[in-house]
């Protein structure tokens, strides 16, 4: 048993058919010796008396706000979360497999530059009685700052009969250096808490590797005289980290007909434009990449060629 | 050419060298890396190599007020993935495929070194640890973990080439 | 086409050593390794070793204490296999193999054992 | 050392019949988790063996009714359609860690 945070304890239970559980004592935080009763969540049967309770915890039966009282006056509470074990794995029941980039992922994370500031997401099929806290640092034996927000609902779903709820989180790195190159990967736990059942979920990254470019901005097309070639020219995102002397992009422009089937023409620049064949009814979509390092492309950013 | 006593490198050749050593590292290695690691023992692997860290002056900052630091940094990482990767490492079994980009990557972590030292010249360099894994599938481990780094190590080396050729070039 | 073929039968006296030949033939000897197997009359099969000739890499099963010394001569694309302070549990067949071992940077992972020798009976008896 | 355990010592199986052979690591034999370094072979008698599967491909030239599975620990060697030129012995051999190790071998027969 655990503290989790005040008054809330988290119970690591083996869970198997006639587990024989945990034995847990509670104290009653008072200066009081006798007289002490104990009760579990709205029930009044009296469980014990005296300033200490001693429970078998074996099931979510077993969890909750266990108060102690004296003549009617309550004189503390302790709330029993379980935690389950199950063949040596703990239990991963609120957050939903994402399954990208590998299984068992159950926290995303993305970082639009190099400034130390990322966002992890999750998805869960639960509406309610759910709590997230997220913690993060940057290395784990010697842990360095790493600052959370706290976790909100970003985006519901429907995904055939079942509702989704993706939440998300934002972080920054207390001390970040954006030119260093990160030997310490970043540690982010979220635990996560739905009615009496805890668990907790973690991921590990270098900000190099969830790095994901917003699209290219401004893109416009100039036609080139007498041709049906076209001056495509965008810019770097605003969110991209500066000087781009430094932290360079690599881009691909992909002119693509109406049709999914046709055939994708596809360049690769360091440049900030390129001239492309514009067929009738195509698009012209430009993405972006770090110039030096193979993370994530940007989403497209496209016009139309007409 | 970078040389101890600080007169400035061939910025553009260090840069198309620095980003044909990226190009080549990725194609060395062109996983992000969702190999499962964790069942492998790391007790041979090696986390000594040396990074390109905040106070190495290679930041645009640091470049401008003195880019010798951050260029002997640079030079110091390059030779010591040089000597990894023409060590028992890389040519032990499993023996890598005759087309492997290693050679060619090898090959340009020893050119990128001369570029910003010329014979003649010494920078202090990082010991190498002597790995010898006792399994050959330990290479493998240390292969991955060895071009991951490297892969990190010259995207750093290659930014501070490309600023230096924009921003500092005679 | 790819050959080894391995010296003749011997008959040994307890403690003394033997030394078995396989000369390769039909392709770059130093491309791939030597392996070196044995079989005891109606038994499975025992890995003894392996020498890489171009990398100079050696693995031994440890069983055999020092016993058994692999070497190679690459000037005449000969491996040899010496197991010294023979027993009459030594009694075998031996059998040489050409092992192929590569790997993209870091999988997959190909291990072949794809030619071997004729074999060579080493007798152990007083 | 790791251990491999092979079962059946032997097998009997009528003509065109399916024939399974289990091989068992003391210890995971496979790297990264999906790299198999786990190897069938074949030995007829009074000859060296022959490699029929290696790792998780089966070698060129080799019937297609034999096919392999299994990681981790746990692998087997299926001939789906047993033939009379496949009565031999067939081993299994991990190349994870030295030393290699073979499983004592499975002998197949004709029912």
């Known amino acids: 048993i655990w503290e989790l945070k005040k008054d809330v304890y988290v119970v690591e239970l083996d869970w198997y058919p006639d587990a024989p559980g945990e034995m847990v004592v509670l104290t009653c935080d008072t200066p009081e010796e006798d007289g002490i009763t104990w009760t579990l969540d709205q029930s009044s049967e009296v469980l014990g008396s005296g300033k200490t309770l001693t429970i078998q915890v074996k099931e979510f039966g077993d969890a909750g706000q266990y108060t102690c009282h004296k003549g009617g006056e309550v004189l503390s509470h302790s709330l029993l979360l379980l935690h389950k074990k199950e063949d040596g794995i703990w239990s991963t029941d609120i957050l939903k497999d994402q399954k990208e980039p590998k299984n068992k992922t159950f926290l995303r994370c993305e970082a639009k530059n190099y400034s130390g500031r990322f966002t992890c997401w999750w998805l869960t099929t639960i509406s309610t009685d759910l709590t997230f806290s997220v913690k993060s640092s940057r290395g784990s034996s010697d842990p360095q700052g790493v600052t959370c927000g706290a976790a909100t609902l970003s985006a519901e779903r429907v995904r055939g009969d079942n509702k989704e709820y993706e939440y998300s989180v934002e972080c920054q790195e207390d001390s970040a250096c954006p030119a260093a190159e990160e030997s310490l990967p970043i540690e982010v736990m979220v635990d996560a808490v739905h009615k009496l059942k805890y668990e907790n979920y973690t991921s590990s990254f270098f900000i190099r590797d969830i790095i994901k470019p917003d699209p290219p901005k401004n893109l416009q097309l100039k036609p080139l005289k007498n041709s049906r070639q076209v001056e495509v020219s965008w810019e770097y995102p605003d969110t991209w980290s500066t000087p781009h002397s430094y932290f360079s992009l690599t881009f691909c422009v992909q002119v693509q007909g109406k049709s999914k089937r046709e055939k994708k023409d596809r360049v690769f620049t360091d440049k900030t434009s390129a001239t492309v064949i514009c067929r009738k009814n195509a698009s012209i979509s430009v993405r972006a990449q770090d110039r030096y390092y193979s993370s994530s492309w940007s989403e497209w950013a496209s016009v139309p060629c007409s | 050419r970078a040389v101890p006593g600080g007169s400035s490198p061939a910025w553009t050749q260090c840069q198309q060298l620095s980003q044909k050593l990226c190009t080549l590292a990725w194609s060395a290695h062109p996983l992000v890396g969702h190999m499962d690691l964790r069942e492998e023992g790391d007790e041979e692997t090696t986390n000594d190599v040396p990074h390109i860290q905040c106070g190495d002056g290679c930041d645009p900052q640091g470049l401008r007020d003195n880019s010798q630091f951050c260029l002997q940094r640079i030079h110091q990482g390059l030779i010591f993935y040089e000597k990894l990767l023409g060590s028992d490492i890389f040519t032990g079994e499993p023996s890598l495929l005759p087309d492997s980009p290693v050679g060619q990557l090898h090959a340009s972590l020893l050119g990128l070194s001369q570029l910003l030292q010329p014979e003649g010249h010494h920078w202090e360099t990082q010991q190498i640890p002597s790995l010898s894994p006792s399994q050959p599938w330990q290479r493998l481990l240390l292969r991955f973990k060895i071009l991951r780094s490297l892969q990190a190590f010259v995207a750093v080396a290659a930014r501070v080439f490309a600023h230096g050729a924009a921003t500092l070039s005679p | 086409q790819v050959q080894l073929v391995q010296s003749g039968a011997e008959v040994k006296k307890p403690g003394s050593s033997v030394k078995v030949s396989c000369k390769a033939s039909g392709y770059t000897f130093t491309s791939y390794g030597i392996t070196w197997v044995r079989q005891a009359p109606g038994q499975g099969l025992e890995w003894m070793g392996e020498?890489?000739?171009?990398?100079?890499?050696?693995y031994y099963n440890e069983k055999f204490k020092g016993r058994v010394t692999i070497t190679a001569d690459k000037s005449t694309s000969t491996a040899y296999m010496e197991l010294s302070s023979l027993r009459s549990e030594d009694t075998a067949v031996y059998y040489c193999?050409?092992?192929?071992?590569?790997?993209?940077?870091?999988?997959?992972?190909?291990?072949?054992?794809?030619?071997w020798g004729q074999g060579t009976l080493v007798t152990v008896s007083s | 050392d790791i251990v491999m355990t092979q079962s059946p010592d032997s097998l009997a199986v009528s003509l065109g019949e399916r024939a399974t052979i289990n091989c068992k690591a003391s210890k995971k034999v496979t790297i990264f988790g999906s790299t198999s370094a786990l190897h069938w072979y074949q030995q007829k008698p009074g000859q060296p063996p022959k490699l029929i599967y290696n790792?998780?491909k089966l070698e060129s030239g080799v019937p297609d009714r034999f096919s392999g599975s299994g990681s981790g620990t746990d692998f087997t060697l299926t001939i789906s359609s047993l033939q009379a030129e496949d009565v031999a012995v067939y081993y299994c051999l991990q190349n994870k860690e030295v030393p290699y190790t073979f499983g004592g071998g499975t002998k197949v027969e004709i029912k």
């Open positions: 790792g998780a």
């Open positions: 193999a050409r092992a192929e071992f590569i790997s993209t940077v870091v999988a997959p992972y190909y291990y072949a054992l794809d030619y």
């Open positions: 020498d890489y000739p171009r990398s100079g890499n050696t």
